[in-house]
């Protein structure tokens, strides 16, 4: 009975309980290929829980190994268009610092209009995940189709 | 030492570690898109720890942000049978009670016969999951091609 | 504050913490269906803590329910590849020992080049998973493209 | 106890036809769905149709065209009708109720080329 007072009276992130749901605000301009994310119980299930949103970019506040969990759907799309729009493809990288950059998740439409996926991935503090979808086609912002999270799973 | 002792003396439940993963038990009666699921260790690993089934589908006992994952294949399926019964879609949302139903995971089958995603969401005690699959095609029993779960992450 | 010192003054195998995160290092011989894996930090991101390799198979080292998730793209694939390659499978179970041998999680590729895809499982110290892909398409080998993991999440 | 029975195989000539008759002693098939599976000489047990309860059908890729499976809610019957039967055709097979684990004894199909 102690251990679970204890737990409940630590602030959670003190057990390291990081987590972030997010959904989509909107496409970046011309020659970005970033998607831009927003996350708050304003705006409905989204929220974040200790990591942060840099201009609609999420940054990770605590070190270890986190679950990075996707899917993007494509905004009127049918598996003739995305055929025809192809090659149309989801990347999820580290973007910032530059000396971390790397692709974490990458997957391509092919005849379908929704990608899913998910994987582990060790993330450190100030890690910052940038989302690139790259062609013509356009993201769907109804939330129950576009959304992007990251769990905290261990040090 | 103390705190791993401590930890195995409580019941898991006290650490909120709710988790599910159902396996597909039928479909619902003409008119119900509802999927109807069971779990047990007599049906193989399809388990309830902490969230029970009412009439097949999926009741949350504790409050909490829950990773819900998802996995449906279509029964005799090709990507010919796909696109000619397009749309076929699966969609995951809180369906009782009726002042929180909201879709929280929307997938479309599109050419493939197999959708799989998941997704971070808070779910409160009471809240109870339906999957609806909607159009004329119908989804596979066999245990590793169809199943549905949820996993307690966090207050 | 107590329990936030004694958590990090345990060991994190002593929690149950068990994880791992796998790339593809090849895929068998002719006749061996199973693809082969590899983990460690002087890999690039993939790691293990907790299970093991056992000539490139994982195998577990702690009872538990795990969530197992796994993505393969193939290599030079478009969807007209995938669909005249039809059917490829990749099938996720355990393999050994014989007594438990069960498959967990299966998907076809149709007209996609990339399936992707998790779900919760019971496992026991000792289970060896193996991951099948049945068919003439080879996987892709990058690291963001191709990768196999479990996390242990309760007792 | 419920049960299902087929009916309606037999040895025939490539090209040629036969009807699958599946009966159960229960208004069962009425409100379920219903499957014809197949099983040939040393390869696993396959799902060759599938039919829901308002009569919405679906038929493997490999039997598109030659077979159909149907059903008489009224008679408590279902059926496969198949035409233009192969050697590949040939098996035994099984009515299922799809959802549950209830399956006939099987009836024998032979095509002889």
């Known amino acids: 009975q102690r251990f679970a007072q204890a737990q409940q009276q630590l602030p959670l992130e003190s057990l390291g309980w990081d987590v972030a749901e997010l959904q989509l605000n909107h496409t970046g301009p011309q020659q970005d290929p970033r998607l831009y994310w927003q996350g708050g119980p304003a705006l409905g299930r989204s929220f974040l829980h200790g990591p942060e949103l840099d201009k609609g970019q999420l940054r990770i506040h605590r070190d270890g190994i986190y679950m990075v969990h996707i899917q993007v759907t494509l905004a009127i799309c049918s598996s003739t268009t995305a055929s025809r729009h192809h090659p149309t493809t989801l990347a999820v990288g580290i973007c910032s610092p530059a000396s971390r950059s790397i692709s974490l998740l990458r997957l391509s439409f092919h005849q379908g209009c929704t990608i899913a996926s998910q994987r582990l991935t060790p993330l450190a503090r100030g890690d910052t995940l940038c989302t690139n979808l790259t062609g013509t086609l356009l993201p769907s912002r109804n939330t129950d189709e576009t959304f992007f999270g990251v769990q905290w799973v261990r040090p | 030492q103390r705190f791993a002792q401590a930890q195995q003396q409580l019941p898991l439940e006290s650490l909120g570690w709710d988790v599910a993963e159902l396996q597909l038990n039928h479909t619902g009666p003409q008119q119900d898109p509802r999927l109807y699921w069971q779990g047990g260790p007599a049906l193989g690993r399809s388990f309830l720890h902490g969230p029970e089934l009412d009439k097949g589908q999926l009741r949350i006992h504790r409050d909490g942000i829950y990773m819900v994952h998802i996995q449906v294949t279509l029964a005799i399926c090709s990507s010919t049978t796909a696109s000619r019964h397009h749309p076929t879609t699966l969609a995951v949302g809180i369906c009782s009670p009726a002042s929180r139903s909201i879709s929280l995971l929307r997938l479309s089958f599109h050419q493939g016969c197999t959708i799989a995603s998941q997704r971070l969401t808070p779910l409160a005690r009471g809240d109870t999951l339906c999957t609806n699959l909607t159009g004329t095609l119908l989804p596979s029993r066999n245990t590793d091609e169809t199943f549905f779960g949820v996993q307690w992450v966090r207050p | 504050q107590r329990f936030a010192q004694a958590q990090q003054q345990l060991p994190l195998e002593s929690l149950g913490w068990d994880v791992a995160e796998l790339q593809l290092n090849h895929t068998g011989p002719q006749q061996d269906p199973r693809l082969y894996w590899q983990g460690g930090p002087a890999l690039g991101r993939s790691f293990l803590h907790g299970p093991e390799l056992d000539k490139g198979q994982l195998r577990i080292h702690r009872d538990g329910i795990y969530m197992v998730h796994i993505q393969v793209t193939l290599a030079i694939c478009s969807s007209t590849t995938a669909s005249r390659h039809h059917p490829t499978t990749l099938a996720v179970g355990i393999c050994s020992p014989a007594s438990r041998s069960i498959s967990l999680l299966r998907l076809s590729f149709h007209q996609g080049c990339t399936i992707a895809s998790q779900r919760l499982t019971p496992l026991a110290r000792g289970d060896t998973l193996c991951t099948n892909l049945t068919g003439t398409l080879l996987p892709s080998r990058n690291t963001d493209e191709t990768f196999f993991g479990v996390q242990w999440v309760r007792p | 106890q419920v049960q299902l029975q087929e009916s309606g195989g037999g040895l025939v000539q490539a090209g040629g036809s036969l009807r699958l008759s599946c009966a159960a002693s229960k208004s069962i098939i009425r409100d379920n769905v219903m499957a014809w599976h197949r099983q040939a000489p040393g390869k696993q047990r396959e799902l060759v149709a599938i039919i829901n309860t308002g009569g919405s059908a679906n038929v493997d890729d490999s039997v598109k065209g030659r077979f159909t499976i149907s059903r008489d809610n009224a008679k408590n019957m279902v059926y496969l009708q198949m035409n233009n039967l192969k050697p590949e055709d040939t098996a035994v097979y099984y009515c299922?109720?799809?959802?549950?684990?209830?399956w006939g004894q099987g009836t024998q199909v032979t095509v002889s080329s």
């Open positions: 299922n109720v799809y959802y549950r684990d209830l």
